[in-house]
Structures are given as C-alpha cells and as structure tokens.
Interface confidence: low
C-alpha cells in the first residue's frame, strides 16, 4: 500500500473539503494559541501544495511524509518562541522526534476566553455571510480548546452545526429554534472529547495492549454474536485509527475511519444484526452511528466459561503457547456474557484470571491451584455494584445539586491539593452520574455509571498531570488504569494537609452574581464550598450544610435588594463572620 | 531461555552523560514491551522510561523527562538508555526489563536483568 506522495493519497481519498478541515484541526490542536487567520493561511498553503503533488506526485517534496510537511508548516509561524515559550524548541529536532515534542506540548487546559455566545441574529447575519469561514471557525475554536478531540467525530459535529443554522436562521423563532440544539451540541462535544482523552491517555501511558484490551472487552459486549477473530480484527483495526488520531495523523486516522466503517457495513451479518439502520446513513453519521450502537442480544446457550478456563486440564498448556490470545479469549468470552458489567471491572477480572495463572501455572498441581479463582471475582464485582447503590440511594434523596455538593466535600477531603477549579469542575462531572445513570435498570446501571467515572476522573488526570500537586492524586493515576476508580473511592480525608489560610477576599460577592445563569450561580457556590472545606477540612456535614444555606438565602436576599452592591458588602461581611464562628475558623 | 544483559554504567560527574545498553535473547524480542528500571542505594525500585514493541510509543518517568531517551533496535535485539545532564539523584543500579504481558493495562516485568551501576558523583 506504498504511495508515492502521502499527501497526494490523503487528499485524493478524502476530498478537499475533508482534507481541509482536517488540517486546520490537526494545526489547531497543535499550536492552541495562533490567531484564526494565520492558521487559515496555513491551512490554504498546504492545499495548495497537495494540490501539486496530486498532479505530479513526483513534484518536488511531494515524497515527504506528512508529519515533516506539515511540521515545517507549523515551524515558518513567526511568533512561535514570543507565543509558546519552549515549543519553539520542537523546531530544532528532526522528525519523528519533532512531532513527539509537538505532542508533548499540547495543554488540556489552554489559557483561552471562555467562549461566549452571541445573539442569535448576530450569528445567522455571520451565518449568511461567510459560511465557510464560519464552520471553520467553529471547528478551530473546539480544536484548539481540545487537542485531543477526536478529528473525524469533530467533523460530524461540525456537519451538525451547519445543519443547526441552515434550519434554524430561517425559522420564524430563529432562538427557540436554535439555542436547545447549540446546547446539545455543547453538551455532546464535551463528553466526546472527554471519552476520547481517556482513549489517548490509555495508548499514551500505558501502552497500546491497554488499549486493545479496553477494546476487546467494549466490542465483545456490543458484538456477542461476533467470532473472537472477528473481534480481535476489528480490535487491530480500531487502535490503528485510534492510535493515529491521539499522535496527530489526523488525515491517516479519518481515512482509516472510513475503511472500517465500509468494512464493518460489508461484514455486518458476521458483527451485529443491530447495524443495519448505521449502515445506510452517509460517511460521517455512519460512523458515529456504529460508534454508539446498542448492544446486539447475546447468543442463545453460551456454555459455561468454566470449561475452557477453569476444568479443562489444558489451561497452563493453552497460556503458556500464547498468553495474549488465550487471555484475549478468555476477555472476550466473559465480556459477552456480560453487557451489565462495566468495562473496567471486565479488565479487572481479567487481570486477576492472569495473576492467578501466573501463579498456578508454576505450582506443583495447577489445577488446584486455579480451581477457586472464580470465586476471587466475587468481591470484585460485588464492590462497584455496592457503591452504585449506595450512590445512586443518595442521587435520589438529594437531587443533582447537592448530590455534587456531596461529592465535592468528599473529594476535597481526599485531595484538597488539586487546584478549586479543578475540585469543582471534576466533582460536576461526578455529580452528573446521578442523572444520567441512576434511572437505568440494575442491568445497564454498572457500565453506565462506572465507565463513566473512568472517562470523568481521566479529566482529574490529565488536568492534575500539567501541575501536579498531590502525591496521592498521582498514585491513583499512573499505578493501574482499570484501578483508578477503586483508588479514589478507597482514599480517605488526608491527614496530613495543612488548611488553608482564611480569606475574606475569597467569600466576597458582588451583584453581578446575580444576573449569572442558574449553573453560573451554582459553580460560585461550589466554588465558595470547596474553599470553606480547605479551611476547614475536619468541618462536618452538618456544619458545611448550615453555612451553605446561609450563602444560598444571603445570595436570595441581596439579588431582590433595591441597593444589591451595599447588600453584598454589608450582609456578606455578616455572613462571613457567621460561618467563621460556625466552623469555629 | 530468556536473558537480559545491561551494560554501559560507570561513573560520571554531574552534568556528564552515558549509554546503557541491553542485549536480548531466548525470545522474540520485537513483540514485547521493554523498560528501564533504577533502584537508588537504599531505596525503592523505580520506573524509569517504557518503549513499545515497534518503537512508535515512548513513557518516562517526570523525574527524567528531557533528560533519558529510551530506544530500541529491534534487529540487533537491543535496548538503550541515552541519559544525559546526569544529576547525583540519578545514581542507583539500572536495570532493563521485560513487560510480559499482551494485555497488559499495567506495569509489570517477568524479566529483569542483573544490573548495571551508574554513579552520578563530583
């Protein structure tokens, strides 16, 4: 599958729009801080040469791989030591270091504007006018903001986007129209980007066998009715495109997207009888489609796992000639059977199984040794089911609101080192749990919930990663991948922190508060909450509750005041002095 | 039979650089996953850098980022350990080693080698 120009093939394969596209969001997520227009000019130098070698593909550079086309181009911007500090230095290495350190440099947590959204009819007229600088617009401020997002879903968003303004700017209510549909927009692409980081953070820091692991046990689940050869082929296949799209081979990884997605609909009847419907749709919704499809039902009388992994005398005989597989097998048949469990807890069984083989496997009498592991998994599965219960009874009696407060007292404690934001917005995201799993049934309830612990406390990770703070928070992250969750949950209050100083400043609060949004009004609380336990980290339930609803009624009182600024001062000062003698600060 | 043979400590001052090296053999050293790992006198093991089967995904510890490159030739069944800007904190036995696993969502070694000394000192 050699080309002559790697350039030349991509663009050939996905079309300019395509191709263009993707550019600019490899560029953006690459260098976060560049102006709109230089990355455009950027974007529309390198068309242009990739329209060269599709002519000619013995043309001059036409022979260079994309990393050191696409690098160079990175490298001509003027300002890149002014804006970007030591990134500059990546220029100085040759490929492929270069674009290692390229990747190095990429910030989860960029020091960009919030992004603000303007009136409904400022965006249509902006809309109307130039169309095609403003979907790239778009897909420039969403990859730059998230370097990690996943470049063809990125795509698909955008196609979306467009389809949102083209209905909605000509409806006669353009912002009922138009607001509910940017929102969801909104609110998927977070957890997309957020789903896809935990995807590069597995490749990027435990290997690409973490990977196929996670996506052996996830694909087993969705496709029970598929051969284990069949899964382990759309396994290889998946991380080649994942492993791509994390390195910044964006052009490669669309492209590969595509051939297995043609691949999977060409081989639907070996996969999944819940394909068809994702089959029919165009490129781009196809792949999304088959990317969250439903699970397929699960074969009719499975035999028991026992036979092959437990009882067969052949057991040491069959690891010992090819542990992967055999491993692999033993992934695959027990995540088929079990769609009600979470992927992490799969992998978790998984690596207790290999253990005990590692172990029984050099014992006098395997088989005695290994009879019993089955029952090892017992405490295993019986911990996540025991904390979605417990958490889920709490969900409901407190509602999400105060179901996050809960969370972020109880993380706070574990960890008052990391950062307020950080608290608050990681917490959030835990909180979010309540609602959107607790309303499953105890079948569905598992993955839901604990998958997505693993996708919200990878957020914690990575932002924790860029200035690392607590040693605790670290161990939790780098020691096992499918034991992160446990890991936090297992924490208790840190002893050893030392509270915070107290700052008035930081419980001071003005009328602007409150013309903020509902949620806008709930981050002030939780972010004041978080403060008040780093002073007071030993302050109990009870006490935290009774100074929050001090500030939730302070908050009421002086938003309907005529003269709201004296209010805030004056009662606020009262109210600070009243939660310093209830928590005895 | 698998052996893991480290090669390249020495003394060094400060400041000053060296190469590990590690010979492999007894199995197909291309489909693995290899490590560096140091124990400094007195203290716990510590990881050090990883480098995938093929080369393609790097790992290194915060502690020696920008510092050590780990690479690998896999047709001569190697293993490197480029440290440069040696600091006394870097002192310790190195020792290259194995990740079994196919699997492996974990760091975990089946084979080690003997070690080799490296002294950071003035």
């Known amino acids: 599958d050699a080309h002559k120009s790697e350039v030349a093939h991509r663009f050939k394969d996905l079309g300019e729009e395509n191709f263009k596209a993707l550019v600019l969001i490899a560029f953006a997520q690459y260098l976060q801080q560049c102006p709109f227009e230089d990355h455009v000019k950027l974007v529309n130098e390198v068309t242009e040469f990739a329209k060269t070698c599709v002519a000619d593909e013995s043309a001059e550079n036409c022979d260079k791989s994309l990393h050191t086309l696409f690098g160079d181009k990175l490298c001509t911007v003027a300002t890149l030591r002014e804006t970007y500090g030591e990134m500059a230095d990546c220029c100085a290495k040759q490929e492929p270091e270069r674009n290692e350190c390229f990747l190095q440099h990429k910030d989860d947590n960029p020091n960009l504007p919030r992004l603000v959204r303007p009136e409904v009819d400022v965006m249509c007229t902006a809309f109307h006018d130039n169309e095609e600088t403003f979907l790239k617009k778009y897909l420039y401020e969403i990859a730059r903001r998230h370097p990690y997002f996943y470049a063809p879903e990125l795509l698909f968003f955008a196609k979306r986007y467009k389809a949102a303004f083209t209905e909605c700017c000509q409806a006669a209510d353009k912002a009922a129209c138009l607001l509910p549909k940017l929102d969801e927009l909104r609110d998927e692409g977070k957890a997309s980007s957020a789903k896809q980081r935990l995807k590069c953070a597995s490749l990027q820091k435990f290997g690409e066998r973490a990977f196929k692991a996670w996506a052996v046990a996830r694909l087993s689940q969705r496709f029970p009715k598929a051969e284990f050869a069949e899964v382990s082929k759309l396994v290889t296949d998946l991380t080649k495109v994942h492993t791509e799209c994390c390195h910044g081979d964006l052009l490669e990884c669309a492209d590969d997207r595509a051939d297995l997605a043609k691949y999977i609909c060409e081989n639907q009847d070996s996969i999944s009888s819940k394909l068809k419907e994702c089959c029919e749709k165009p490129l781009l919704e196809k792949s999304h489609c088959i990317a969250e499809v439903e699970n397929d039902e699960m074969p009719a009388d499975l035999p028991s796992l026992a036979a092959d992994f437990v009882e067969s005398k052949d057991v040491c005989k069959n690891y010992a000639e090819a542990k992967d597989v055999f491993l692999g097998m033993f992934l695959y048949e027990y995540a088929r059977r079990h769609p009600d469990y979470s992927v992490v807890l799969l992998l978790r069984l998984a690596k207790t199984y290999e253990t005990t083989l590692e172990k029984c496997c050099a014992a006098a009498d395997p088989h005695e040794c290994y009879a019993k592991v089955f029952d090892e998994f017992k405490p295993l599965v019986e911990e996540p089911q025991n904390l979605i219960k417990q958490n889920c009874e709490l969900f409901e009696q407190l509602g999400e609101y105060k179901f996050q407060n809960a969370l972020l007292v109880r993380y706070t404690k574990k960890v008052p080192q990391v950062s307020t934001p950080t608290l608050v917005e990681v917490s959030r995201n835990l909180g979010k749990v309540g609602s959107k799993c607790c309303k499953h049934p105890e079948a569905k309830r598992m993955p839901c919930a604990e998958d997505y612990l693993s996708v919200v406390l990878n957020q914690l990770c990575v932002l924790h990663e860029k200035t690392p703070v607590s040693d605790r928070v670290t161990k939790c992250c780098t020691e096992s991948l499918v034991n992160r969750r446990p890991c936090f949950s297992a924490l208790e209050v840190d002893e050893t922190y030392v509270p915070k100083e107290f700052n008035a400043e930081t419980f001071t609060f003005h009328a602007d508060i409150c013309t903020l949004s509902e949620k806008e009004r709930q981050i002030k609380k939780q972010t004041a909450l978080v403060e008040l336990v780093k002073h007071k980290p030993k302050a109990t339930k009870e006490q935290l509750k009774a100074v929050m609803d001090d500030f939730a009624a302070f908050v009421e009182k002086c938003c309907k005041a005529d003269d709201k600024e004296t209010c805030f001062a004056e009662e606020g000062k009262k109210l600070v002095a009243a939660s310093q003698a209830a928590l005895g600060l | 039979e698998v052996q893991l043979l480290e090669s390249g400590g020495g003394l060094v001052k400060p400041g000053g650089s060296l190469r590990l090296s590690c010979a492999a053999s007894?199995?197909?050293?291309?489909?693995?996953?290899m490590n560096w790992v140091r124990q400094a006198p007195g203290k716990r093991l510590e990881w050090v850098s990883s480098i995938s089967s093929a080369g393609t995904h790097i790992y290194s510890a915060d502690s020696v980022k920008g510092r050590f490159t780990i690479s690998r030739d896999n047709a001569k069944n190697s293993l490197y350990l480029q440290m440069n800007s040696l600091r006394a904190e870097d002192t310790g036995v190195y020792y290259c080693a194995r990740d079994p696993h196919s699997t492996g969502w974990y760091k975990d070694f089946d084979y080690w080698g003997q070690g080799t000394l490296v002294t950071v000192s003035s």
């Open positions: 007894g199995f197909t050293f291309s489909n693995y996953n």
